[in-house]
Interface confidence: low
Amino acid sequence: APLVCRAGCSPEHGFCEQPGECRCLEGWTGPLCTVPVSTSSCLSPRGPSSATTGCLVPGPGPCDGNPCANGGSCSETPRSFECTCPRGFYGLRCEVSGVTCADGPCFNGGLCVGGADPDSAYICHCPPGFQGSNCEKRVDRCSLQPCRNGGLCLDLGHALRCRCRAGFAGPRCEHDLDDCAGRACANGGTCVEGGGAHRCSCALGFGGRDCRERADPCAARPCAHGGRCYAHFSGLVCACAPGYMGARCEFPVHPDGASALPAAPPGLRPGDPQR
């Protein structure tokens, strides 16, 4: 079966050596290799020059790692940084909460725990499926990546389901239907992968999906010009009608004794079965 990388794996920056993998080329990261390792620009005014790229690599800035808590946004000042805090938070790093449980800060059915006085902080205990300090973020249930072999994860609310790519099946798309492993072709046939399902290339005289059916080599009427077909252990033999010759009686014999047969290879007389 063709190698199937993890669903969504970047075709430009990712590759795989096993089904379901997404391994990143240098300079890219993330589960799907879509995130550049450095978001720095060559126009960056700060920092030493990188020997490998020639770009300026930023040194640590005051806003690096976002020192502002509780969703505050950081902006650099000439000397340090400044946090713009969301409603209900204050302090240098937005670390002090002015919100209490009385304000109903927990979303999505989260349980608020904390004192009623203005100085006390609160904690939201989130229900399954939600996270964040206010239970405001829905957990991406498909982040568990349960679907193998590039299957698409579907969150149905009550359950996860995997929609498998062609050639794969199972609750996690873990079964490779193209896989010849463990699928024997009978009577000397060989397994060929591809096309969404394995198939058998059968030895002479056998047919069917697994080469279990004995094939009649004469069923297709292979002998031309009224020749009679005889099944033989090694294939078929044509007994040609008068005036015809060749393995399949395809060549007329000319009255003068010459034939329309192409020059025979060494050791093979015209009219001999060609196998």
């Epitope: 993998e21 391994r23 589960p31 957990v139 349960p146 359950a159």
Partner: antibody, heavy 114, light 112 residues
């Protein structure tokens, strides 16, 4: 493809310790990686996980006591302050999905004793 | 916290026999089927047997069978062989504020 844990040793209570899980034959950052421990004669105990997207999750008892971090070839388990109850063999394991971890390291023994 | 209870804690059976191990969870595993079974022999790491509650891991003989969903799961080992003597663990995945795993207490299988 294999995993090997290292860093286990005899330490005194209160000592911090870092265990390292090293991968051979594959890159760790496309898999979920868990840390599990097993006290002598006891069962398996899940410590935490770093998923393929880099997010970390911990057992409730392990939060604040252990930290998991990852590079493409190693996963570290940092213990802040060990107690005698942390004496165990520590395993790391690889999973393509959270419900099956198919490659395990042999384990590294941590003994905490005064 | 979730409690995963494995029963029995120890079971003994003859070669060629069948053993059944139960795993009960105090809350439903994620998606009702995020449950795995492992085999562990002394001095060795665990070995994955079954994942997705009933799917056989690569290379594991079909004598091992997993069943169940939600909070009740079963591992059945038929045609018992001497090599099956080991401790078996169930492992569930759960959804909470984030995600977490938990193991059952283990079941020791003795083959006579």
């Amino acid at each position: 493809q294999s995993l090997e844990e290292s860093g286990g040793r005899l330490v005194t209570p209160g000592t911090p310790l870092t265990l390292t899980c090293t991968a051979s034959g594959f890159s760790l950052n496309t898999y979920h990686m868990i840390w599990v421990r097993q006290a002598p004669g006891k069962g398996l105990e899940w410590i935490g996980i770093v998923d393929s997207g880099g997010s970390t999750y911990y057992a409730s008892w392990a939060k604040g006591r252990f930290t998991i971090s990852r590079t493409s070839t190693t996963v570290d388990l940092k213990a802040t302050s060990l107690t005698t109850e942390d004496t165990a063999t520590y395993f790391c394991a690889r999973g393509g999905s959270w419900d099956g971890f198919n490659i395990w390291g042999p384990g590294t023994l941590v003994t905490v004793s005064s | 916290d979730v409690v995963m209870t494995q029963t029995p804690s120890s079971v003994s059976a003859a070669v060629g026999g069948t053993v059944t191990i139960n795993c009960q969870s105090s809350q439903s595993v994620y998606n009702s089927d995020f449950l795995a079974w492992y085999q562990q022999k002394p001095g060795q790491p665990p070995k994955l047997l079954i994942y997705a509650a009933s799917t056989l891991a690569s290379g594991v003989p079909s004598r091992f069978k997993g069943s169940g969903s939600g909070t009740q799961f079963t591992l059945t080992i038929s045609d018992l062989e001497c090599d099956d003597a080991a401790t078996y663990y169930c492992q569930g995945t759960y959804e909470d504020v984030g995600w977490f795993n938990d193991f059952g207490g283990g079941t020791e299988v003795v083959v006579k």
